[in-house]
Interface confidence: low
Protein backbone atom coordinates (compact mmCIF):
# COMPACT_ATOMS: atom_id res chain seq x y z
CA UNK A 1 0.00 0.00 0.00
CA UNK A 2 1.17 3.52 -0.81
CA UNK A 3 1.38 5.34 2.11
CA UNK A 4 -0.49 8.75 2.49
CA UNK A 5 2.67 11.01 2.15
CA UNK A 6 4.43 9.16 -1.09
CA UNK A 7 2.89 10.95 -4.03
CA UNK A 8 2.29 8.01 -7.00
CA UNK A 9 3.66 9.07 -10.47
CA UNK A 10 1.72 10.47 -12.80
CA UNK A 11 2.88 8.95 -16.81
CA UNK A 12 0.89 11.85 -18.43
CA UNK A 13 -2.26 13.98 -18.39
CA UNK A 14 -4.09 12.31 -21.19
CA UNK A 15 -7.68 11.90 -20.54
CA UNK A 16 -8.68 8.19 -20.21
CA UNK A 17 -11.87 6.59 -21.95
CA UNK A 18 -13.40 3.73 -22.34
CA UNK A 19 -13.10 1.00 -24.93
CA UNK A 20 -16.38 2.91 -26.49
CA UNK A 21 -14.44 6.11 -25.90
CA UNK A 22 -16.51 7.66 -22.84
CA UNK A 23 -14.86 9.66 -20.91
CA UNK A 24 -13.61 7.55 -17.92
CA UNK A 25 -14.09 8.98 -14.74
CA UNK A 26 -11.75 8.25 -11.53
CA UNK A 27 -14.15 5.71 -9.41
CA UNK A 28 -15.20 5.54 -5.78
CA UNK A 29 -13.39 2.68 -3.70
CA UNK A 30 -13.04 2.15 -0.01
CA UNK A 31 -10.04 2.79 0.81
CA UNK A 32 -8.94 1.92 4.75
CA UNK A 33 -5.55 0.34 3.96
CA UNK A 34 -4.75 -2.82 6.39
CA UNK A 35 -7.67 -2.64 9.33
CA UNK A 36 -8.36 -5.53 11.68
CA UNK A 37 -11.19 -7.29 10.80
CA UNK A 38 -14.04 -10.04 12.63
CA UNK A 39 -15.41 -10.62 8.86
CA UNK A 40 -14.95 -15.22 9.02
CA UNK A 41 -16.52 -18.20 7.62
CA UNK A 42 -19.55 -16.15 5.84
CA UNK A 43 -20.71 -15.58 2.39
CA UNK A 44 -20.17 -12.02 2.60
CA UNK A 45 -18.93 -8.71 4.41
CA UNK A 46 -19.17 -5.49 4.87
CA UNK A 47 -15.72 -3.51 4.79
CA UNK A 48 -16.86 -1.50 7.95
CA UNK A 49 -14.16 0.96 6.11
CA UNK A 50 -15.19 4.34 6.75
CA UNK A 51 -13.52 6.28 4.13
CA UNK A 52 -14.82 6.38 0.47
CA UNK A 53 -12.06 8.19 -1.84
CA UNK A 54 -12.04 9.25 -5.28
CA UNK A 55 -9.21 7.14 -6.62
CA UNK A 56 -6.66 8.93 -8.19
CA UNK A 57 -6.18 7.61 -11.28
CA UNK A 58 -9.07 6.93 -13.85
CA UNK A 59 -8.10 3.77 -14.63
CA UNK A 60 -7.54 2.17 -11.42
CA UNK A 61 -10.09 -0.03 -9.90
CA UNK A 62 -11.32 -1.16 -6.27
CA UNK A 63 -9.48 -3.84 -4.50
CA UNK A 64 -10.16 -6.02 -1.22
CA UNK A 65 -7.57 -8.58 0.38
CA UNK A 66 -8.58 -10.57 3.44
CA UNK A 67 -6.29 -12.41 4.95
CA UNK A 68 -6.17 -15.02 8.28
CA UNK A 69 -2.74 -15.96 10.04
CA UNK A 70 -2.96 -17.39 13.55
CA UNK A 71 -3.16 -13.84 15.08
CA UNK A 72 -5.73 -11.66 13.18
CA UNK A 73 -7.66 -11.37 10.50
CA UNK A 74 -7.11 -8.11 8.52
CA UNK A 75 -9.07 -6.57 5.35
CA UNK A 76 -7.37 -4.13 3.19
CA UNK A 77 -9.33 -1.53 1.01
CA UNK A 78 -7.28 0.33 -1.54
CA UNK A 79 -7.86 1.54 -5.33
CA UNK A 80 -4.89 -0.22 -7.76
CA UNK A 81 -4.19 0.25 -11.41
CA UNK A 82 -4.93 -3.48 -12.74
CA UNK A 83 -2.46 -2.95 -15.33
CA UNK A 84 -0.09 -3.45 -12.23
CA UNK A 85 0.28 -6.63 -9.88
CA UNK A 86 -0.77 -6.13 -6.29
CA UNK A 87 0.68 -8.32 -3.87
CA UNK A 88 2.52 -10.06 -6.36
CA UNK A 89 -0.74 -11.09 -8.02
CA UNK A 90 -2.82 -9.85 -11.27
CA UNK A 91 -6.11 -8.34 -11.06
CA UNK A 92 -7.99 -11.23 -12.95
CA UNK A 93 -11.35 -9.90 -12.16
CA UNK A 94 -10.89 -6.17 -12.32
CA UNK A 95 -13.85 -5.31 -15.02
CA UNK A 96 -16.32 -7.03 -12.26
CA UNK A 97 -18.84 -5.17 -10.75
CA UNK A 98 -19.07 -7.17 -7.95
CA UNK A 99 -15.74 -8.05 -5.23
CA UNK A 100 -15.72 -11.85 -5.78
CA UNK A 101 -13.04 -12.83 -3.29
CA UNK A 102 -10.64 -15.65 -4.97
CA UNK A 103 -8.13 -17.50 -3.18
CA UNK A 104 -4.10 -16.97 -3.71
CA UNK A 105 -1.24 -19.06 -2.23
CA UNK A 106 0.52 -17.43 0.14
CA UNK A 107 2.69 -19.29 2.67
CA UNK A 108 1.57 -19.57 6.19
CA UNK A 109 -1.42 -17.51 6.28
CA UNK A 110 -4.94 -17.44 3.94
CA UNK A 111 -5.20 -15.13 1.56
CA UNK A 112 -8.29 -14.27 -0.34
CA UNK A 113 -8.32 -10.66 -2.69
CA UNK A 114 -10.98 -9.06 -4.98
CA UNK A 115 -11.36 -6.40 -7.74
CA UNK A 116 -13.73 -4.71 -8.77
CA UNK A 117 -15.19 -1.45 -10.75
CA UNK A 118 -18.02 -0.01 -9.75
CA UNK A 119 -18.20 2.55 -6.74
CA UNK A 120 -17.74 1.16 -3.29
CA UNK A 121 -17.58 -2.31 -5.18
CA UNK A 122 -14.88 -3.15 -2.24
CA UNK A 123 -17.40 -2.37 0.71
CA UNK A 124 -18.94 -5.78 0.21
CA UNK A 125 -16.71 -8.36 -0.51
CA UNK A 126 -18.09 -11.83 -1.38
CA UNK A 127 -16.35 -15.31 -0.82
CA UNK A 128 -19.53 -16.90 -2.05
CA UNK A 129 -20.20 -17.47 -6.19
CA UNK A 130 -23.97 -17.52 -5.19
CA UNK A 131 -24.15 -13.69 -4.62
CA UNK A 132 -27.46 -13.17 -3.17
CA UNK A 133 -28.93 -10.85 -5.21
CA UNK A 134 -31.91 -9.98 -3.20
CA UNK A 135 -29.37 -7.60 -0.63
CA UNK A 136 -30.38 -3.76 -1.24
CA UNK A 137 -28.10 -1.75 -3.37
CA UNK A 138 -25.25 0.08 -1.50
CA UNK A 139 -26.12 3.54 -1.19
CA UNK A 140 -23.26 4.90 -3.43
CA UNK A 141 -22.26 8.39 -1.60
CA UNK A 142 -18.91 10.37 -1.50
CA UNK A 143 -16.79 9.87 0.89
CA UNK A 144 -19.74 8.32 3.41
CA UNK B 1 5.89 27.43 -5.68
CA UNK B 2 2.47 26.08 -4.59
CA UNK B 3 0.03 28.85 -3.96
CA UNK B 4 -3.77 28.68 -3.69
CA UNK B 5 -5.52 32.09 -3.63
CA UNK B 6 -8.90 32.77 -2.50
CA UNK B 7 -11.23 35.92 -3.58
CA UNK B 8 -14.73 36.45 -3.67
CA UNK B 9 -15.51 37.47 0.11
CA UNK B 10 -17.55 40.70 0.88
CA UNK B 11 -20.65 41.68 2.74
CA UNK B 12 -23.31 40.17 2.13
CA UNK B 13 -27.03 40.47 3.49
CA UNK B 14 -28.74 37.26 5.11
CA UNK B 15 -29.84 35.51 1.95
CA UNK B 16 -28.02 36.85 -0.23
CA UNK B 17 -25.30 35.20 -2.81
CA UNK B 18 -21.68 34.93 -3.23
CA UNK B 19 -19.31 32.93 -5.44
CA UNK B 20 -15.72 32.90 -4.27
CA UNK B 21 -12.98 31.37 -5.85
CA UNK B 22 -9.68 29.85 -5.68
CA UNK B 23 -6.79 29.90 -8.17
CA UNK B 24 -4.19 27.39 -8.01
CA UNK B 25 -0.85 27.06 -8.96
CA UNK B 26 2.32 24.91 -8.33
CA UNK B 27 1.03 21.58 -8.39
CA UNK B 28 -1.18 19.27 -11.18
CA UNK B 29 -4.92 21.04 -10.18
CA UNK B 30 -6.29 18.26 -12.10
CA UNK B 31 -5.00 15.38 -10.17
CA UNK B 32 -6.20 16.36 -7.10
CA UNK B 33 -9.32 16.24 -5.07
CA UNK B 34 -9.49 19.82 -3.75
CA UNK B 35 -11.90 21.36 -0.08
CA UNK B 36 -13.02 24.44 1.31
CA UNK B 37 -12.66 24.47 5.25
CA UNK B 38 -13.93 27.08 7.09
CA UNK B 39 -13.60 29.43 10.18
CA UNK B 40 -16.05 31.34 12.15
CA UNK B 41 -14.33 34.86 13.56
CA UNK B 42 -12.33 33.73 17.21
CA UNK B 43 -13.65 29.82 16.29
CA UNK B 44 -12.29 26.64 15.08
CA UNK B 45 -11.91 24.98 11.96
CA UNK B 46 -15.04 23.57 10.01
CA UNK B 47 -14.62 21.40 6.68
CA UNK B 48 -17.51 22.48 4.55
CA UNK B 49 -16.61 20.86 0.38
CA UNK B 50 -15.20 18.47 -1.08
CA UNK B 51 -14.84 18.10 -5.13
CA UNK B 52 -13.01 15.04 -7.39
CA UNK B 53 -9.98 16.08 -9.17
CA UNK B 54 -12.40 15.48 -12.35
CA UNK B 55 -15.19 17.59 -10.84
CA UNK B 56 -18.08 14.67 -11.04
CA UNK B 57 -18.34 14.06 -7.41
CA UNK B 58 -19.44 16.59 -4.62
CA UNK B 59 -19.61 16.40 -1.27
CA UNK B 60 -21.00 19.03 1.51
CA UNK B 61 -21.26 19.20 5.07
CA UNK B 62 -25.11 18.94 6.31
CA UNK B 63 -25.26 22.29 7.25
CA UNK B 64 -24.87 23.81 3.88
CA UNK B 65 -26.23 21.25 1.57
CA UNK B 66 -28.72 22.15 -0.81
CA UNK B 67 -27.42 26.25 -0.04
CA UNK B 68 -23.47 25.66 -1.48
CA UNK B 69 -22.17 24.25 -4.70
CA UNK B 70 -18.65 23.34 -5.11
CA UNK B 71 -16.94 23.41 -8.72
CA UNK B 72 -13.72 23.45 -10.54
CA UNK B 73 -12.44 24.41 -13.70
CA UNK B 74 -9.55 22.29 -14.26
CA UNK B 75 -8.56 24.58 -17.57
CA UNK B 76 -8.40 27.82 -15.90
CA UNK B 77 -6.82 25.74 -12.47
CA UNK B 78 -9.59 27.26 -10.69
CA UNK B 79 -11.87 25.81 -7.50
CA UNK B 80 -15.06 27.88 -6.80
CA UNK B 81 -17.97 27.98 -4.10
CA UNK B 82 -21.17 29.16 -5.08
CA UNK B 83 -22.56 30.08 -1.73
CA UNK B 84 -26.65 30.95 -2.17
CA UNK B 85 -29.33 31.93 0.79
CA UNK B 86 -26.56 33.01 3.10
CA UNK B 87 -27.15 32.38 7.05
CA UNK B 88 -25.09 34.83 10.18
CA UNK B 89 -23.85 31.78 10.81
CA UNK B 90 -21.89 31.32 7.79
CA UNK B 91 -19.74 34.14 8.24
CA UNK B 92 -15.99 33.03 8.55
CA UNK B 93 -12.83 33.34 6.67
CA UNK B 94 -13.01 30.22 3.66
CA UNK B 95 -10.04 28.70 3.56
CA UNK B 96 -9.25 26.18 0.00
CA UNK B 97 -7.37 23.31 0.62
CA UNK B 98 -5.77 20.19 -1.43
CA UNK B 99 -6.97 16.76 -0.34
CA UNK B 100 -9.48 15.14 1.51
CA UNK B 101 -9.85 12.00 -1.08
CA UNK B 102 -7.43 11.50 -3.33
CA UNK B 103 -5.67 7.77 -2.76
CA UNK B 104 -6.15 8.17 0.74
CA UNK B 105 -4.51 11.16 1.03
CA UNK B 106 -6.91 12.61 4.06
CA UNK B 107 -5.53 15.94 5.12
CA UNK B 108 -5.65 18.64 3.90
CA UNK B 109 -2.21 20.28 2.72
CA UNK B 110 -1.17 22.99 1.58
CA UNK B 111 -4.30 25.59 2.37
CA UNK B 112 -5.10 29.33 1.31
CA UNK B 113 -4.56 32.26 3.10
CA UNK B 114 -8.48 32.68 3.18
CA UNK B 115 -11.21 35.29 1.87
CA UNK B 116 -13.20 36.60 4.20
CA UNK B 117 -17.35 36.18 4.25
CA UNK B 118 -19.36 38.68 6.50
CA UNK B 119 -23.30 37.87 6.54
CA UNK B 120 -25.24 40.97 7.97
CA UNK B 121 -28.02 43.15 7.55
CA UNK C 1 -19.77 12.64 13.10
CA UNK C 2 -16.82 12.13 15.36
CA UNK C 3 -16.40 14.72 17.99
CA UNK C 4 -12.70 15.55 18.77
CA UNK C 5 -11.44 17.23 22.42
CA UNK C 6 -8.10 19.06 22.73
CA UNK C 7 -7.15 19.66 26.08
CA UNK C 8 -5.86 22.31 27.26
CA UNK C 9 -7.90 25.07 25.61
CA UNK C 10 -4.93 27.47 26.18
CA UNK C 11 -1.67 27.17 27.91
CA UNK C 12 1.46 29.61 28.73
CA UNK C 13 4.97 28.58 28.37
CA UNK C 14 8.28 29.54 27.95
CA UNK C 15 10.91 29.36 25.35
CA UNK C 16 12.71 26.02 25.70
CA UNK C 17 9.87 24.15 27.67
CA UNK C 18 8.66 20.81 26.54
CA UNK C 19 4.73 21.27 25.44
CA UNK C 20 2.54 18.32 25.18
CA UNK C 21 -1.68 18.57 23.65
CA UNK C 22 -4.09 15.98 23.75
CA UNK C 23 -6.79 15.31 21.53
CA UNK C 24 -9.51 12.63 22.26
CA UNK C 25 -12.10 11.32 19.47
CA UNK C 26 -15.56 10.27 20.66
CA UNK C 27 -14.85 6.86 19.30
CA UNK C 28 -12.00 5.12 18.05
CA UNK C 29 -10.22 6.56 15.23
CA UNK C 30 -6.94 4.13 14.50
CA UNK C 31 -4.30 6.10 13.48
CA UNK C 32 -6.81 8.76 11.17
CA UNK C 33 -5.54 11.53 13.40
CA UNK C 34 -3.45 15.11 11.76
CA UNK C 35 -2.63 18.08 13.61
CA UNK C 36 -2.28 21.58 12.11
CA UNK C 37 -0.58 24.66 13.35
CA UNK C 38 -2.55 27.97 12.89
CA UNK C 39 -0.84 31.31 13.70
CA UNK C 40 -3.29 34.53 13.59
CA UNK C 41 -4.62 35.89 10.80
CA UNK C 42 -2.47 33.25 8.57
CA UNK C 43 -3.68 29.48 6.71
CA UNK C 44 -3.80 26.30 9.10
CA UNK C 45 -0.04 24.36 8.29
CA UNK C 46 0.20 20.29 8.71
CA UNK C 47 2.52 19.71 10.89
CA UNK C 48 1.51 15.53 11.82
CA UNK C 49 -0.64 13.66 9.80
CA UNK C 50 -1.65 9.69 10.72
CA UNK C 51 -1.08 10.09 13.98
CA UNK C 52 3.12 10.18 14.16
CA UNK C 53 4.14 11.01 10.57
CA UNK C 54 5.80 14.28 10.35
CA UNK C 55 5.11 16.45 7.36
CA UNK C 56 7.95 17.32 5.28
CA UNK C 57 9.42 20.70 6.29
CA UNK C 58 8.19 20.56 9.52
CA UNK C 59 10.36 20.50 12.39
CA UNK C 60 11.68 17.10 14.22
CA UNK C 61 10.72 18.84 17.53
CA UNK C 62 7.12 18.15 16.93
CA UNK C 63 5.82 14.94 17.17
CA UNK C 64 2.91 13.16 17.58
CA UNK C 65 2.10 9.38 19.14
CA UNK C 66 -1.33 7.78 20.25
CA UNK C 67 -4.02 5.76 18.78
CA UNK C 68 -7.60 4.74 18.85
CA UNK C 69 -9.17 7.58 20.98
CA UNK C 70 -6.28 9.56 22.22
CA UNK C 71 -3.44 11.30 20.77
CA UNK C 72 -0.73 13.76 21.63
CA UNK C 73 1.35 16.26 19.85
CA UNK C 74 4.72 17.13 21.74
CA UNK C 75 7.03 20.33 21.05
CA UNK C 76 10.20 19.03 22.66
CA UNK C 77 11.97 22.28 23.40
CA UNK C 78 9.83 25.35 22.69
CA UNK C 79 10.74 27.98 20.03
CA UNK C 80 9.25 31.65 19.68
CA UNK C 81 7.59 30.59 16.28
CA UNK C 82 5.90 27.81 17.39
CA UNK C 83 3.40 30.27 19.48
CA UNK C 84 0.45 29.96 17.67
CA UNK C 85 -3.28 27.74 17.87
CA UNK C 86 -3.12 23.77 17.37
CA UNK C 87 -5.59 21.94 15.88
CA UNK C 88 -6.39 18.32 15.57
CA UNK C 89 -8.43 16.75 12.78
CA UNK C 90 -10.03 12.87 12.18
CA UNK C 91 -9.96 11.54 9.51
CA UNK C 92 -11.36 8.17 9.80
CA UNK C 93 -14.67 9.30 8.61
CA UNK C 94 -16.24 11.68 6.89
CA UNK C 95 -17.05 14.64 7.41
CA UNK C 96 -13.68 15.06 8.82
CA UNK C 97 -13.82 17.23 12.29
CA UNK C 98 -11.30 18.87 14.10
CA UNK C 99 -10.60 19.81 17.70
CA UNK C 100 -11.74 22.89 18.94
CA UNK C 101 -7.94 24.26 18.81
CA UNK C 102 -4.96 24.63 21.86
CA UNK C 103 -3.53 28.30 22.11
CA UNK C 104 -0.05 28.26 22.89
CA UNK C 105 0.84 31.47 24.83
CA UNK C 106 3.96 33.18 25.94
CA UNK C 107 4.39 32.93 29.60
Known amino acids: TIPPHVQKSVNNDMIVTDNNGAVKFPQLCKFCDVRFSTCDNQKSCMSNCSITSICEKPQEVCVAVWRKNDENITLETVCHDPKLPYHDFILEDAASPKCIMKEKKKPGETFFMCSCSSDECNDNIIFSEEYNTSNPDLLLVIFQ | QVQLVESGGGLVQPGGSLRLSCAVS????????MSWVRQAPGKGLEWVSA????????HNTDSVTGRFSISRDNSKNTLYLQMNSLRAEDTAVYFC??????????????WGQGTLVTVSS | DIQMTQSPSSLSASVGDRVTITCRAS??????LNWYQQKPGKAPKLLIY???SLQSGVPSRFSGSGSGTDFTLTISSLQPEDFATYYC?????????FGQGTKVEIK
Open chain 2, 97 to 110: AKGLAASGKNYFDP
Open chain 2, 26 to 33: GFNFRRYA
Open chain 2, 51 to 58: ISASGDRT
Open chain 3, 27 to 32: QSISSY
Open chain 3, 50 to 52: AAS
Open chain 3, 89 to 97: QQSYSTPPT
